[in-house]
């Protein structure tokens, strides 16, 4: 039996970006009908992971796993009924805590992003890596790139593959 | 506010192993009072990740994230009451599906382990990587090594850091 996952296409895109595998990223983006400007924006983020080397991929994977398996994702506010939990917690939707992190990565300040990461994983090496990645993204991406990345994320979150 | 996570020390150890960072692994193992034979066992697993290169680290991170954010981990069987859910789903305990995967990685056959991974992430490249890692671990680790790895996992699961 194949288990339902929370928004598998999001994790496929995230790990293709973090892995530096441009071919897998392209393929994943094709599945959500990404435009050329949206692809360009994601590839700029991918470049930051590649330039920052292996450590950034592994540490950011650790952050993503930690957030995805946190209390925040495992039952947002402990809903009042099991019926609510069935609807709200156990669907395939991406967890709001993951969404928040991605939004801050694109639109927040480095301090805001690092502060949010620190809520989940406070290892100094993780926070340093988060700041390096955030600074790289801010340097590489124009406002238009960031808007394109956000519009792509909306496509991902609303995709039937999520 | 620092969020509670599901067994943070487990993920610290997993990502130190997958990252190939022996210093971080040693530090994490010191925190759970690992014995020398337990350290040796974990370093043999780490060697497999290092030998298999970057792709194995990223892909295994994807598997771990997928399982950790799966329905299995987000509410094992949808408990009957919110009280139960508070106790069983939203604590800091490691998710049983993650435990099962780690146990099979050490004690199962390659087919059993790959079959369990396939329930969560059926990408051919992921399954091939899982098999390579499993075969490597079976070749490197003696039965005694595996027993030491399992005893270390018990320490991790019962640690106050979990």
């Amino acid at each position: 039996v194949k288990m339902a996952e929370t928004c598998p296409i999001f994790y496929d895109v995230f790990f293709a970006v973090a892995n530096g595998n441009e071919l897998l990223l392209d393929l994943s983006l094709t599945k959500v009908n990404a435009t050329e400007p949206e692809r360009t924006a994601m590839k700029k983020i991918q470049d930051c992971y590649v330039e920052n080397g292996l450590i950034s991929r592994v540490l950011d994977g650790l952050v993503m796993t930690t957030i995805s398996s946190s209390k925040d994702c495992m039952g947002e506010a402990v809903q009042n009924t099991v019926e609510d939990l069935k609807l709200n917690t156990l669907g395939r939707e991406i967890c709001p805590a993951v969404k928040r992190g991605v939004d801050l990565f694109l639109t927040g300040t480095p301090d805001e992003y690092v502060e949010q990461v620190a809520q989940y994983k406070a290892l100094p090496v993780v926070l340093e890596n988060a700041r390096i990645l955030k600074n790289c993204v801010d340097a590489k991406m124009t406002e238009e790139d960031k808007e394109n990345a956000l519009s792509l994320l909306d496509k991902i979150y609303t995709s039937p593959l999520c | 506010v620092k969020m509670a996570e599901t067994c943070p020390i487990f993920y610290d150890v997993f990502f130190a192993v997958a990252n190939g960072n022996e210093l971080l692994l040693d530090l994490s193992l010191t925190k759970v009072n690992a014995t020398e034979p337990e350290r040796t066992a974990m370093k043999k697993i780490q060697d497999c990740y290092v030998e298999n290169g970057l792709i194995s680290r990223v892909l295994d991170g994807l598997v771990m994230t997928t399982i950790s954010s799966s329905k299995d981990c987000m509410g094992e069987a949808v408990q009957n009451t919110v009280e139960d859910l508070k106790l069983n789903t939203l604590g800091r305990e490691i998710c049983p599906a993650v435990k099962r995967g780690v146990d099979l990685f050490l004690t199962g056959t390659p087919d059993e382990y790959v079959e369990q991974v396939a329930q969560y992430k059926a990408l051919p490249v992921v399954l091939e990587n899982a098999r390579i890692l499993k075969n490597c671990v079976d070749a490197k680790m003696t039965e005694e090594d595996k027993e030491n790895a399992l005893s270390l996992l018990d320490k991790i699961y019962t640690s106050p850091l979990c």
């Epitope: 530096g20 595998n21 441009e22 392209d26 983006l29 094709t30 599945k31 990404a34 590839k43 | -």
Partner: antibody
Framework: EVELLESGGGLVQPGGSLRLSCAAS????????MSWVRQAPGKGLEWVSS????????HFADSVKGRFTFSRDNSKNTLYLQLSSLRAEDTAVYYC???????????WGQGTLVTVSS | DIQMTQSPSSLSASVGDRVTITCQAN??????LNWYQQRPGKAPNLLIY???NLETGVPSRFSGSGSGTDFTFTISSLQPEDIATYYC?????????FGPGTKVDIK
């Protein structure tokens, strides 16, 4: 107009090597993933390998993994498929194709025939 | 790896006939499927992408449908120039695989 032109095919002995090239024109080469697809005489199509546009990430079919390497030179708008440890079952027409979004083979070359025989 | 099957393996039809080819995947591939035409002695040509989207410049008599594991390719009115072999191909993930092909000729 998009054009893809393969070259380098020929007769080679089992165990031997060959390098195929594909010269591309009529589009921004580095913006597209590219692929090789082969067709054994009288048989169907078989995907061989794909390579991404800028950084050259590659994936291969299991049947050629470890024997074939795929590279590109974006400054020359050219692809290279290095075939080594060739076997009789590698005998085929090799097509290079543009891979839109890494998924759709929207333009194809005319193919180059590789024959592996003693 | 994902296996693709096609049926029929060959068919003969008259000019103007409606022709239908099916393609089946051995696991769910969503709509990640393309259709190609290969005329004798020529390179293949993309007709349909993402299960149902007509490639630019392809005549509207060609269409595709389906999702999950079962897909259909249709020529609404067969023309002499449609004599060819037709292949489906998935792109759910690497490795990509093609169906074995369906050979279409004129009665």
């Amino acid at each position: 107009e998009v054009e893809l032109l393969e070259s380098g095919g020929g007769l080679v002995q089992p165990g031997g090597s060959l390098r195929l090239s594909c010269a591309a024109s009529g589009f921004t080469f580095s913006s597209y993933a590219m692929s090789w697809v082969r067709q054994a005489p009288g048989k169907g199509l078989e995907w061989v390998s794909s390579i991404s546009g800028r950084v050259g990430s590659t994936h291969f079919a299991d049947s050629v993994k470890g024997r074939f390497t795929f590279s590109r030179d974006n400054s020359k708008n050219t692809l290279y498929l290095q075939l080594s440890s060739l076997r009789a079952e590698d005998t085929a027409v090799y097509y290079c194709a543009r891979s839109r979004g890494a998924a759709y083979f929207d333009y194809w070359g005319q193919g180059t025939l590789v024959t592996v025989s003693s | 790896d994902i296996q693709m099957t096609q049926s029929p393996s060959s068919l003969s039809a008259s000019v103007g006939d409606r022709v239908t080819i099916t393609c089946q995947a051995n696991q769910d591939i969503s709509n990640f499927l393309n259709w190609y035409q290969q005329r004798p002695g020529k390179a293949p040509n993309l007709l349909i992408y993402a299960a149902s989207n007509l490639e630019t410049g392809v005549p509207s008599r060609f269409s595709g449908s389906g999702s999950g594991t079962d897909f259909t390719f249709t020529i609404s009115s067969l023309q002499p120039e449609d004599i060819a072999t037709y292949y489906c191909q998935h792109y759910d993930n690497f490795p990509f695989t093609f169906g074995p092909g369906t050979k279409v000729d004129i009665k």
